[in-house]
Interface confidence: medium
């Protein structure tokens, strides 16, 4: 059975878009009409995990690229990275846990909690042009996103 994938654009609750700023870094910034097509499109795969009523395990790849968001420990801190993968092996139903996020729907917004590091979320800064990172929902960091469906 082929793995189920859906395609989305994500914006944080301040309406900042996510763009690929160098080969392995996502940044959040406000885009205007002319450069709106710079937004990355995510391929969301529904993967093996421990689903509950409010948490759906997903993996987030970049459409058209062999890159997936993954969560690893770097210098003692859970860290978000873009990881290059073998396109012959990925996506797969049993994504390694570092690739898995619990998609949590809160009202009309969505949060992405790391399965590897509970209570750590895909986050953006209040400031413009800052990297997307893994945060523990402290201070002014933004963890709520809206999802815009993109036809495959």
């Amino acid at each position: 059975v082929p793995i189920r994938q859906l395609h989305y654009r994500l914006r944080d609750e301040q309406q900042k878009s996510l763009v690929l700023s160098d080969p392995y870094e996502l940044k959040a910034l406000h885009l205007n009409g002319q450069n709106i097509n710079q937004q990355v499109i995510f391929s969301m795969s529904f993967v093996q995990g421990e689903p509950s009523n409010d948490k759906i395990p997903v993996a987030l790849g970049l459409k058209g690229k062999n890159l997936y968001l993954s969560c690893v420990m770097k210098d003692g801190t859970p860290t978000l990275q873009l990881e290059s993968v073998d396109p012959k092996q990925y996506p797969k139903k049993k994504m390694e846990k570092r690739f898995v996020f619990n998609k949590i729907e809160v009202k009309s917004k969505v949060e992405f909690e790391s399965a590897e590091f509970p209570n750590w979320y895909i986050s953006t800064s209040q400031a413009e042009h800052k990297p997307v990172f893994l945060g523990n929902n402290s201070g002014q960091d933004i963890i709520d996103f809206t999802m815009e469906s993109v036809s495959s």
Epitope: Q48, S70, V72, M73, Q89, K93, K94, E96, K97, R98
Partner: antibody, heavy 120, light 107 residues
Framework: QVQLVESGGGVVQPGRSLRLSCAFS??????????VGWIRQAPGKGLEWVAH???????SYADSVKGRFTISKDNSKNTVYLQMNSLRAEDTAVYFC????????????WGQGTLVTVSS | DIQMTQSTSSLSASVGDRVTITCRAS??????LSWYQQKPGKAVKLLIY???KLHSGVPSRFSGSGSGTDYTLTISSLQQEDFATYFC?????????FGQGTKLEIK
């Protein structure tokens, strides 16, 4: 307490087949997240992961055995099998089975191993 | 495939010594590393998982550290029962690969 016991090893000629069994107790392979792998050790050498099966039947193989070896399980018998076909001299090794949980794959409990010798 | 290299195949030490065994991966394995102890005729034992977490029942003299591509198993004060062969295993991606092993011998 978890136990794994391998059996089925022996001397076999190149090109022939052998089936190894791993009988286990203390856990169920139908439990979500559970897995059992086969790891081998050629005489005087290090450990080499060979094959793996998950609770839901998903299988993985090392390139060196892909297409020749097949891993399977019988949940009612609490046993995992390794069917080895087209055996080669380089398959000579002690074969261990070991248990892990889904991702990441540290092998928590190991059996004592069974020796397979491929020789004419 | 990710290659795991234990550059020291054998190591001589005495009871009470502090011993360090190293393992290097051919690429970043993001701390997905475990350490095992093997003694002749005995079942292999898991010592350390996820680089530094001590498996239950393993004496606290064993510890693990590292990141990226370089990892270390340390025995703070060697005991008689620690003379054995030690292997590392990377679990970041298939195929899962072991180091060649380091045999710890009595000096």
């Amino acid at each position: 307490q978890v136990q794994l016991v391998e059996s089925g090893g022996g001397v076999v000629q190149p090109g022939r087949s052998l089936r190894l069994s791993c009988a286990f107790s203390g856990f169920s392979l139908s439990t979500s997240g559970m897995g059992v792998g086969w790891i081998r050790q050629a005489p005087g050498k290090g450990l080499e992961w060979v094959a793996h099966i998950w609770w839901d039947g998903d299988e993985s193989y090392a390139d060196s055995v892909k297409g020749r070896f097949t891993i399977s399980k019988d949940n009612s018998k609490n046993t995992v099998y390794l069917q080895m076909n087209s055996l080669r001299a380089e398959d000579t090794a002690v074969y261990f089975c070991a248990r892990n949980r889904y991702d990441p794959p540290w092998f928590v409990d190991w059996g004592q191993g069974t020796l397979v010798t491929v020789s004419s | 495939d990710i290659q795991m290299t234990q550059s020291t195949s054998s190591l001589s030490a005495s009871v009470g010594d502090r011993v360090t065994i190293t393992c290097r991966a051919s690429q970043d394995i993001s701390n997905y590393l475990s350490w095992y102890q093997q003694k002749p005729g005995k079942a292999v034992k898991l010592l350390i998982y996820y680089t530094s977490k001590l498996h239950s029942g393993v004496p606290s003299r064993f510890s693990g550290s590292g990141s990226g591509t370089d990892y270390t198993l340390t025995i703070s004060s060697l005991q008689q029962e620690d003379f054995a062969t030690y292997f590392c295993l990377q679990g970041k991606m298939l195929p899962w690969t072991f180091g060649q092993g380091t045999k710890l011998e009595i000096k």
